[in-house]
């Protein structure tokens, strides 16, 4: 139509200027479009430079929209992680504070002379919860061995107990069960509770990490071309009022985000596993009941040792021989009164129930995040047409969009009419994140069955992605070298936060 040749480019000028570009680039009236490399080559208001600028801008706008959506999800996961982490740490800190407040009165020097051992145990539990690569059962066994050695010396100040005698005592300990049932009960319950708590919190960390890393994956050149065509070619072709057809937009974004959609299956598995493991937060071996009550098991153990002292001493002498007596030492330590025990069952505060129900609801809401992303971005960011099908922008003109909407994921983009997707070349970063999701899901499943897993080794999948494994700080990266259990008990790993303690020495 000859009349269209003189059509003004006023609207395009306005839009282009609003984007911050120089108006000197914009022709006064339409020009022939043979120079266009992305948009259809009819009469146009866009020069080559304008097309390139708008292509870059549309690419940047999609990446920003993608990052914004990811940021909302990341913020939700981070808030959840903080809430649960605060709660679990609070339970353990509360237990330690109770121990520090009540044990000196209940047990006197049996506690004060061993405060460092108790402090280190809580530090170990904190480290374990925070993802350090240490074996909880071994840690507890070392604590009891260390405590037995010191308490036995204290209960028998009249005896000379050289290293070889203490070594013998350590070897006898398992058969003697000096602390009664408390060590076994604590081991069984604590392993289940701590592994559930830490794997849940790590799951939140991994999910957040995956979202962050995936949001940084750049969109390819084919995607850039398709998005330019979707968003700005209508302006260049003189139909600036035409908004993209919904199905057209979906096909473009399904092509652009094909790799991201492949996260869907493993993402769902992870969230399902996280919801499932919250079942382990309740009951007598539940997180709240166990983590908040560590001190009661310790009190029970010391009481048992005092009650069993005479039998224990006789059995130790039977197994290790008669130790020498210090002539200046006093007689055996007087039996102390039993330390009063706080009730073992910690009444639930209601905080955890509230946290869990909120988390379950929010995790359910984001289960289909990756496959719903194209639709979400199209409806929220792309100003889709609400007009009848034949009035929207279909990539060539104003009119109906005929191609069918593609399925989700990389494999389904083989015939995507809008974005040329090489389905034989999956994005490596996203593959690595799929692997991270799988690994974390396996940890959660193990944790659900009460099994401890080596968190460090589990994340060494050879992918080299550097995706954190959900640790709360740098602890997971530190392989803790530990002695195998032996009679010479190494100290346990105290937490950096508990530093510069003054006061009672407990060597």
């Amino acid at each position: 139509d000859p009349a269209s040749k003189s059509r003004s480019c006023g609207e395009v000028r306005q839009i282009y200027g609003a984007k911050g570009f120089s108006l000197s680039d914009v022709p006064q009236a339409e020009i022939s479009g043979e120079h266009l490399r992305i948009c259809p080559q009819g009469y146009t208001c866009c020069t080559s430079e304008m097309e390139e600028n708008l292509a870059n801008r549309s690419h940047a706008e999609l990446e920003t929209a993608l990052r914004d959506s990811s940021r909302v999800l990341q913020a939700m996961l981070a808030t959840q992680l903080r809430s649960f982490d605060d709660h679990f740490q609070h339970l353990l800190n509360d237990s330690e504070r109770t121990l520090q407040a009540t044990f000196p009165g209940a047990f006197g020097e049996l506690y004060t002379q061993n405060a460092r051992a108790f402090r280190d145990l809580y530090s170990e539990l904190r480290l374990y919860y925070r993802g350090a690569n240490l074996h909880l059962e071994e840690t507890l066994a070392e604590f009891w061995a260390r405590l037995l050695e010191r308490l036995f010396k204290q209960l028998h100040p009249q005896l000379l107990l050289p290293d070889d005698y203490l070594d013998c005592l350590g070897k006898q300990a398992e058969a003697l069960r000096p602390f009664g049932e408390a060590p076994r009960e604590l081991r069984l319950r604590a392993t289940r509770a701590f592994v559930a708590a830490r794997s849940f919190v790590q799951g939140l960390g991994v999910a957040s990490d995956v979202v962050r890393k995936v949001a940084q994956v750049p969109l390819g050149p084919e995607c850039s071309r398709a998005v330019m065509k979707l968003v700005y070619c209508a302006h260049c072709l003189g139909v600036p009022g035409a908004r993209p057809c919904p199905d057209y937009c979906r096909n473009v974004l399904k092509g652009c985000l094909a790799n991201q959609a492949d996260l869907d299956a493993e993402w769902r598995n992870l969230l399902d596993s996280m919801v499932l493991i919250t079942d382990k937060f309740w009951g007598t071996s539940g997180v709240e009941s166990v983590i908040g009550s560590v001190h009661t098991w310790l009190a029970e153990a010391i009481n048992a040792l005092q009650d069993n002292r005479d039998t224990l001493t006789a059995k130790v002498i039977q197994g290790c021989g008669n130790p020498k007596v210090n002539p200046q030492g006093p007689g055996p330590e007087e039996k102390r009164r039993r330390g009063k025990l706080a009730p073992r069952e910690r009444p639930p505060s209601g905080t955890l129930e509230k946290l869990v129900s909120e988390a379950k609801a929010q995790l359910r809401d984001v289960q289909d995040f990756w496959i719903s992303l194209p639709g979400t971005l199209c409806s929220e960011k792309m100003a889709l047409s609400t007009a009848s099908d034949d009035r929207c922008w279909n990539g060539m003109a104003r009119g109906r969009y005929l191609p069918e909407v593609m399925g989700d994921g990389l494999a389904n983009q083989i015939n995507n009419p809008e974005v040329e997707v090489d389905i034989t070349k999956p994005d490596m970063t996203i593959r690595q994140q799929i692997m991270q999701l799988k690994i974390m899901t396996n940890r959660l499943r193990s944790a659900y069955n009460g099994n401890d897993v080596d968190f460090q080794d589990a994340s060494d999948d050879g992918s080299g992605s550097g995706s954190g494994d959900g640790c709360l700080d740098d602890l997971c990266s530190r392989k803790v070298s530990r002695k195998s259990s032996s009679s010479r008990t190494p100290l346990t790993h105290a937490l950096p936060g508990l530093s510069e303690q003054e006061g009672q020495k407990t060597s």
């Epitope: 020097e109 002379q113 460092r116 051992a117 280190d120 530090s123 480290l127 260390r146 050695e149 010191r150 010396k153 204290q154 100040p157 000379l160 107990l161 290293d163 203490l166 210090n326 030492g329 803790v480 070298s481 530990r482 002695k483 010479r488 008990t489 190494p490 100290l491 346990t492 790993h493 105290a494 937490l495 950096p496 508990l498 530093s499 510069e500 303690q501 003054e502 006061g503 009672q504 020495k505 060597s507």
Partner: antibody, heavy 119, light 107 residues
């Protein structure tokens, strides 16, 4: 066998800081607390503090608390003691010492590092 | 802080003599006491832990005794290599503290 090897002698000006290292070998580094003890010329022994090598958890003698920092590097099995705001009375031999078993008794000692503070 | 008081501050002895050094704690420390020997220019070396337990490598002529607040280190027959300074140390409470030292000199 257990060995603790300390860094060489240092001469410092008043107000400066010094960082002494102690490299451990022959045992599980993270398994035992490490302590720092100093000895001024012709004087007795003075305990400065301890560090848990596996995590860096520290307990300091109140006398030094404002000026001392003990750290460790598990990758090299080394502990460090840094003393700041040095004064002439800090001139001493500084020893690292490892506990025997969990008992606050020092079975293994470094060879000592002489720190001289002089203007 | 627990103050550890050693006496005498120095003692002169001949080879073969019996020498005793005492250490008094300002408060009850049970048996949490160690004894060290220091030769000039060398690091201290542990002799006794838990007040009376001889450490491996320490000669049997050294012995420790005591409990609570009063402790003694005895050298049954002084040898030439024993002329050194001896320190006691309490391991009961922070800060760990040492006695002022006792110098065993050749008469």
């Amino acid at each position: 066998q257990v060995q603790l090897v300390q860094s060489g002698a240092e001469v410092k000006k008043p107000g400066a800081s010094v960082k002494v290292s102690c490299k451990a070998s022959g045992y599980t580094f993270t398994g035992y607390y490490m302590h720092w003890v100093r000895q001024a010329p012709g004087q007795g022994l003075e305990w400065m503090g301890e560090i848990n090598p596996s995590t860096g958890d520290t307990t300091y003698n109140q006398k030094f608390k404002a000026r001392v920092t003990m750290t460790r590097d598990t990758s090299t099995s080394t502990v460090y003691m840094e003393l700041s705001s040095l004064r002439s009375e800090d001139t001493a031999v500084y020893y690292c010492a490892r506990e025997k078993r969990d008992d606050g008794v020092f079975a293994y000692w470094g060879q000592g590092t002489l720190v001289t503070v002089s203007s | 802080d627990i103050v550890m008081t050693q006496s005498p501050s120095s003692v002169s002895a001949s080879v073969g003599d019996r020498v005793s050094i005492t250490c008094r704690a300002s408060e009850h420390i049970n048996g949490w006491l160690a004894w060290y020997q220091q030769i000039p220019g060398k690091a201290p070396r542990i002799l006794i832990s838990s007040a009376s337990i001889l450490q491996s490598g320490a000669p049997s002529r050294f012995s420790g005794s005591g409990f609570g607040t009063d402790f003694t280190l005895t050298i049954s027959s002084v040898q030439p290599e024993d002329f050194a300074t001896y320190y006691c140390q309490q391991a009961k409470s922070y800060p760990l503290t040492f006695g002022g030292g006792t110098k065993v000199e050749i008469k």
